[in-house]
């Protein structure tokens, strides 16, 4: 008995397309082996018509495809433009045609249903508008005009020129009689429903001399576009519904069971909680098109998505729609990285961001997701030396450790830094990832003085106290600038007395600035790292002033004002225009967007052993 399963009988009509799904056990071998569709011959052989290795028979050229979905254990054979010659016995299978891992399918293509003479066929997409034109002769110009729909054996009145409208069409149909010169009336039906499909008859006059015209209305439900993305990666749905709905509310919904389509996001401000922090609905263009980006793809995100337009911001009968079937590949090329990073007020976090290692030269970005309106993600920092003004001195994007990962360090954390952040590049847009920063109770591990004032020409010593938990870590001091943090020489001054219950392994490491100059003014960080992996950091702002008295300055924790948020910013600091990710295709052009969020931010991350998806700034 073969483990392959599919439809035993498929019935269709000439000119139609069929979509045949074959199911197989999704073992590793099965997922990657050849898939085929073959036609059984009279003498028992089976001639391949299409296979997953790219072969397409001349009989199927331009009208068939085979798509494998390894995560689902299915492959789908689509065949278009069917003719009666396609009727026959087929097999869908795995491996070699003659080896038995297959399933028998009988395909029967019958002649299409004949249309009445002189029938005009209208083929229109669901939710769109159709105009049925009905000619008549002069003698019927003043007579009643009507449109009927054939229901079973009987014609049912849909609309007429005396003002009648069938309740099924209320609010979405009108009958227009052209100017006197034209012997034509037309019926316009908007927001087409699947149930509108069928045979119509328009008529001018009611007697034996009436003019009649047959119309066949076919309402097409959009075939879902198949989208196959990696777990933890991102997907962009581009939705172009046409200019006629440019001013109507837009939505993206995910079909659950039955007719239900749960709103994922819409332009009326609704957003499903499961997508908090990882979705953006891009502002629509003048033609009504828009796009939705979802990052941090999860297994449960797989499914059928519809975008549409309706004043309610959700799917209603007659909404114009586009459809996608999203598959989430669990054999992902995107490495696992923590989805939650925890830090304490005044502390720091070090976030690891994956990127496509083939694109090491791409520009790296980090942005803060904002949920207001349809979601946006203003840039905070990039790898080309741009840092948003409010983040100067406490945010750095480092190319280390490299080879597919970069690091973002944020310190001087406050509660306002809690939120969702996106890692991305100007290269492969599928590699956008999301991390949530949570601010938890606790004290920063590294202890430094608050803001420090140095005197021109003198020596300044700034202490940084490292608890014993960091005894095995490399300790460093560096000077922050827009492009990173340049390492400086520092002195290990032995055990620190700043920690209770901490043994000789605690450390006091000092930064010494000899003969202070104006150029020494700025932000300094002390921190820990292991190789190219960064842990916690603490920041100190050093101001430089002139002083009459000579000598050196040694700053202690007690003398310093330790307010973690306070910054003394030189008025010469440049305010660079705010940048925001608006276009999820990313940076075809850089767009400046007013950023209403004015935040001071910073944090140290703690390890939560309860979740492999969480990362602490001090752990590695």
């Amino acid at each position: 008995k073969s483990p392959i399963f599919g439809p035993e009988e498929v019935n269709s009509v000439e000119g139609n397309s069929v979509s045949i799904t074959c199911y197989y056990p999704p073992t590793s071998v099965n997922r990657h082996t050849r898939k085929y569709w073959c036609r059984q011959g009279a003498r028992g052989g089976c001639i391949t018509l299409i296979s997953s290795e790219g072969y397409v028979s001349s009989k199927y050229a331009g009208r068939a495809n085979l798509t494998n979905f390894p995560e689902n254990g299915t492959f789908v054979v689509n065949i278009a433009q069917l003719s009666q010659d396609d009727s026959g016995r087929y097999k869908c299978g795995l491996g070699i045609n003659s080896r038995g891992l297959s399933f028998d399918v009988s395909l029967e293509v019958s002649q299409g249903p004949g249309l009445l003479n002189d029938t005009k066929v209208y083929t229109v997409d669901l939710g769109r508008t159709v105009t049925i034109n009905c000619p008549f002769k002069t003698e019927n110009a003043q007579k009643r005009k009507s449109l009927y729909k054939q229901i079973g054996l009987y014609p049912v009145l849909v609309i007429d020129s005396s003002g009648y409208v069938n309740p099924n069409y209320t609010g979405r149909i009108r009958l227009d009689i052209q100017g006197t010169g034209q012997l034509l009336f037309s019926v316009v039906i908007n927001q087409l429903r699947l149930s509108d499909a069928g045979q119509y008859l328009c008529q001018a006059g009611d007697d034996s001399n009436s003019n009649k015209k047959n119309a066949d209305l076919q309402v097409l439900k959009p075939e879902p576009e198949l989208v196959y993305e990696d777990l933890r990666g991102s997907v962009t749905f581009h939705c172009a519904l046409g200019p006629e709905v440019a001013n109507v509310a837009k939505f993206l919904c995910r079909q659950s069971s039955g007719e239900n389509c749960d709103v994922v996001v819409n332009t009326l401000g609704k957003r499903a909680p499961a997508f908090e922090g990882r979705i953006l609905l891009n502002p629509q263009d003048k033609d009504g098109s828009f796009s939705v980006v979802i990052t941090g793809l999860r297994k449960e995100d797989a499914g059928r998505y519809l975008c549409g337009a309706h004043s309610d911001g959700q799917l209603q009968e007659g909404s114009p729609i586009q459809a996608w079937q999203l598959f989430v590949n669990e054999e992902s090329t995107i490495p696992r990285s923590p989805t939650v990073v925890k830090g304490v007020a005044g502390g720091s976090v070090a976030v690891l961001c994956p990127y496509n290692r083939k694109e090491s030269k791409s520009i790296k970005y980090w942005c803060l997701w904002e949920g207001a309106q349809n979601g946006r993600c203003p840039l905070l920092v990039d790898s080309e030396g741009w840092v948003k003004a409010q983040y100067e001195g406490r945010l750095s994007l480092l190319e280390e450790p490299g080879n597919g990962t970069f690091t973002v360090i944020l310190n001087q954390l406050t509660s306002r830094d809690a939120g969702f952040y996106w890692c991305l590049t100007n290269g492969d847009t599928l590699w956008r990832t999301t991390v949530e920063i949570k601010i938890i109770e606790g004290e920063p591990n590294l202890k430094v003085p608050g803001n420090v004032t140095a005197v021109l020409g003198e020596t300044l010593k700034v202490p940084c106290h490292f608890p014993c938990k960091f005894s095995s870590y490399e300790k460093y001091w560096c000077k922050w600038n827009n492009t990173g943090c340049q390492a400086l020489p520092s002195q290990d001054e032995g055990p620190s007395k700043a920690f209770v219950n901490c043994d000789e392994n605690s450390r006091l490491v000092s930064l010494t600035l000899n003969l202070v100059t104006r150029a020494d003014e700025g932000w300094y960080w002390c921190g820990v790292k292991q190789g190219h992996f960064y842990g916690e950091t603490a920041a100190v702002y050093v101001a430089v002033e002139e002083r009459k008295a000579a000598g050196s300055r040694d700053v202690s924790l007690a003398k310093a004002d330790a307010a973690p948020d306070e910054k003394v910013l030189d008025s010469g600091f440049r305010e660079i225009e705010n940048k925001a990710i608006q276009d999820p295709r990313l940076f075809a052009e850089e767009k400046a967007v007013a950023d209403t969020r004015d935040q001071a931010d910073g944090s140290r991350a703690s390890v939560d052993s309860g979740s492999s998806e969480e990362q602490g700034g001090s752990s590695r």
């Epitope: 399963f5 009988e9 498929v10 045949i20 979905f69 069971s257 079937q325």
Partner: nanobody, 129 residues
Framework: EVQLVESGGGLVQAGGSLRLSCAAS????????MGWFRQAPGKEREFVAA??????????YYAESVKGRFAISRDNAKTTAYLQMGSLNPEDTALYYC????????????????????WGQGTLVTVSS
């Protein structure tokens, strides 16, 4: 909301035949799927057969255990699905459920209950030896 009502169950001798009907009311589907599942006492619900229709196409699926003995069909106008059961044997004894859905994902295994949103109450088929 869609209601499904099964009928046609009963007691039949081994080797005999029965025809089950499943009538859907509440709304009509221009595309969709109707399937039959069965559950014998103390056993899990298992797939029997399904019929899917869309855009003038019909797809019929059968469980290995009923191939060649059972046939599924539907009456388009009456929104009713039928299961013609022949060569019945005592192993076919079970409560037979009808299930339906509008256009389930073509990529979900139709032999599992998950793709079906609407379910009937079941009709009992007893095959005596």
């Amino acid at each position: 909301e869609v209601q499904l009502v099964e009928s046609g169950g009963g007691l039949v001798q081994a080797g005999g035949s029965l025809r089950l009907s499943c009538a859907a009311s509440g709304r009509t589907f221009s595309s969709g799927i109707m399937g039959w599942f069965r559950q014998a006492p103390g056993k899990e619900r298992e797939f029997v057969a399904a019929i899917e229709w869309s855009g003038g196409n019909t797809y019929k699926y059968y469980a290995e255990s009923v191939k060649g003995r059972f046939a599924i069909s539907r009456d388009n106008a009456k929104t009713t699905a039928y299961l013609q059961m022949g060569s019945l044997n005592p192993e076919d004894t079970a409560l037979y459920y009808c299930a339906a859905d509008e256009s389930p994902s073509r990529y979900i295994d139709l032999r599992r209950p998950a793709p079906y949103h609407y379910w009937g109450q079941g009709t009992l088929v007893t095959v005596s030896s």
